[in-house]
């Protein structure tokens, strides 16, 4: 018979074919894993299911962003009786199955991490063949990617009344603190706009008025490191132009 129940592990409404009272569908994932940009991470995911000794076709899937509807980043399929889950999808070739789905393990390795990978991931298993059933983690695992600061843009821009302003944009996690130094400035935190909407790891600092010619240096720092970059302002006196 078919029944619907609430799974307490994932607090997920799930319909299952009831075949044995010994086990039920559940998924075990940690709330969060952390790793540094450029390194690798492991997203653990194990599950239990009610279909004892199931050896039919199965598919393992990982999604990003949101459960059920989020884009797939990894998918593999194992034929009946096979221990090998053949990869059918690995986004950018960076997702690799570590676990053996036949042994209830869907754990995934993510290589060459980038700050853009900082999101929630959801594992899912699908049974086909004699038994048709599927289950997906609802809460997923948050991948927290940390990164030393990197200055992505530094520039001098014209502003009204023949003046100039400087902008420095850096990325990092934790979001870096930015400081400007330069002629007659000392060390200035300047006008920090952080983090930008939809760009959670980007921080921008502005020097609204560059009053002296010379070298202006932006320094970005967080608990993982620091980075700096400079721009030069040289105005042609008697003219309205500037060289940077």
């Amino acid at each position: 018979f078919v029944r619907t129940k609430i799974d307490t592990t994932e607090n997920l409404l799930n319909t299952e074919v009831h075949s044995s009272p010994a086990q039920r569908w559940s998924m075990q994932v940690p709330p969060e894993v952390s790793a540094e940009a450029g390194d690798a991470a492991v997203l653990p995911c194990t599950f239990t299911h009610p279909h004892r000794h199931y050896d039919g076709p199965l598919t393992a899937i990982w999604r990003a962003g949101e459960p059920y509807a989020g884009p797939q980043v990894f998918r593999c399929a194992a034929a009946r009786g096979s221990e090998l889950c053949q990869t059918a999808l690995s986004l950018h070739g960076r997702f690799r199955l570590l676990g053996n789905p036949r042994r209830n393990d869907l754990s995934l390795r993510v290589e060459r991490l980038a700050l853009a990978d900082d999101r929630r991931y959801f594992c899912r298993v699908e049974f086909a063949g004699d038994v048709h059933d599927r289950y997906e983690s609802r809460h997923g695992v948050r991948l927290h990617v940390t990164a030393a600061p990197r200055i992505v843009n530094i520039s001098v821009l014209p502003s009204p009344a023949h003046a100039f302003r400087a902008l420095c944009t850096a990325e990092g996690e934790p979001p870096p603190a930015l400081a400007w130094s330069g002629p007659a400035l000392g060390n200035s935190l300047a006008a920090v706009r952080s983090p930008r909407e939809g760009h959670g790891h980007l921080v921008t600092a502005e020097l609204p008025a560059l009053t002296h010619d010379g070298r202006y240096t932006c320094t970005a720092a967080n608990s993982l490191g620091r980075s700096e970059a400079s721009v030069y302002l040289f105005r042609f006196h008697g003219a309205s132009g500037a060289s940077t």
Epitope: P44, T87, S90, G93, R96, L98, R109
Partner: antibody
Framework: EVQLVESGGGLVQPGGSLRLSCAAS????????MNWVRQAPGKGLEWVAQ??????????FYAASVKGRFTISRDNAKNSLYLQMNSLRAEDTAVYYC????????????WGQGTLVTVSS | EILMTQSPATLSLSPGERATLSCRAS??????????IHWYQQKPGQAPRLLIY???NLASGIPARFSGSGSGTDFTLTISSLEPEDFALYYC?????????FGQGTKVEIK
């Protein structure tokens, strides 16, 4: 039965080139990553290169000691793995093993018997 | 790159005895409980053979007297009771970070 059979080894002068081949059988070659691992006479094992499969865009990886000199490639239609070795040095003298690895793990679950490359003048 | 150090270089034991081989990595090779360390056996004139993968998983066809343990930087291969065919060279290998690196090997010889 999984089988990996290497060929192409031999004696070559320093600065010369050699192309090793590995014929695979007994498994679906397309599903696996393939590697070359070498062992200098009386020494330990050294991983040389890896080539991934189609899903992983045939990405290649090399040990620093051979990068720029060696090229790993595969021909899935022929179930074959290759290692093109250029600018050979005396320290490249070794038995070269072809080894298979699963897409999920960079360990080597099956190995060939190896082919000896000797670089000497 | 990650440096793998095995000890002892040689282990002299008798058949039936317990063998304990150590492997130390220069940095942690464990991520989220997964240890990227693997063990191989090599006999003279033969190719290596996978014994243990990811620290503690027995490879296909390997007898249960072989076991692996450890986490972080320190790992152990144990042979519970040595059989005559177990006298050979043993290597550990890490796949935590490319390039994949091997230890220098431990030779298990008959005492």
């Amino acid at each position: 039965e999984v089988q990996l059979v290497e060929s192409g080894g031999g004696l070559v002068q320093p600065g010369g080139s050699l192309r090793l081949s590995c014929a695979a059988s007994g498994f679906n070659f397309n599903d696996y990553f393939m590697n070359w691992v070498r062992q200098a006479p009386g020494k330990g094992l050294e991983w040389v290169a890896q080539i991934r499969n189609k899903i992983y865009t045939y990405a290649t990886f090399y040990a620093a000691s051979v990068k720029g000199r060696f090229t790993i490639s595969r021909d899935n239609a022929k179930n074959s793995l290759y290692l093109q070795m250029n600018s050979l040095r005396a320290e490249d003298t070794a038995v070269y093993y072809c080894a298979r690895s699963l897409t999920g793990g960079d360990y080597f679950d099956y190995w060939g018997q190896g082919t000896l490359v000797t670089v000497s003048s | 790159e990650i440096l793998m150090t095995q000890s002892p270089a040689t282990l002299s034991l008798s058949p039936g005895e317990r063998a304990t081989l150590s492997c130390r990595a220069s940095q942690s090779v464990t991520i989220s409980g997964y240890s990227f360390i693997h063990w191989y056996q090599q006999k003279p004139g033969q190719a290596p053979r996978l014994l243990i993968y990811r620290a503690s998983n027995l490879a296909s066809g390997i007898p249960a007297r072989f076991s692996g343990s450890g986490s972080g930087t320190d790992f152990t291969l144990t042979i519970s009771s040595l059989e005559p065919e177990d006298f050979a060279l043993y290597y550990c290998q890490q796949s935590r970070k490319s390039p994949w690196t091997f230890g220098q090997g431990t030779k298990v010889e008959i005492k």
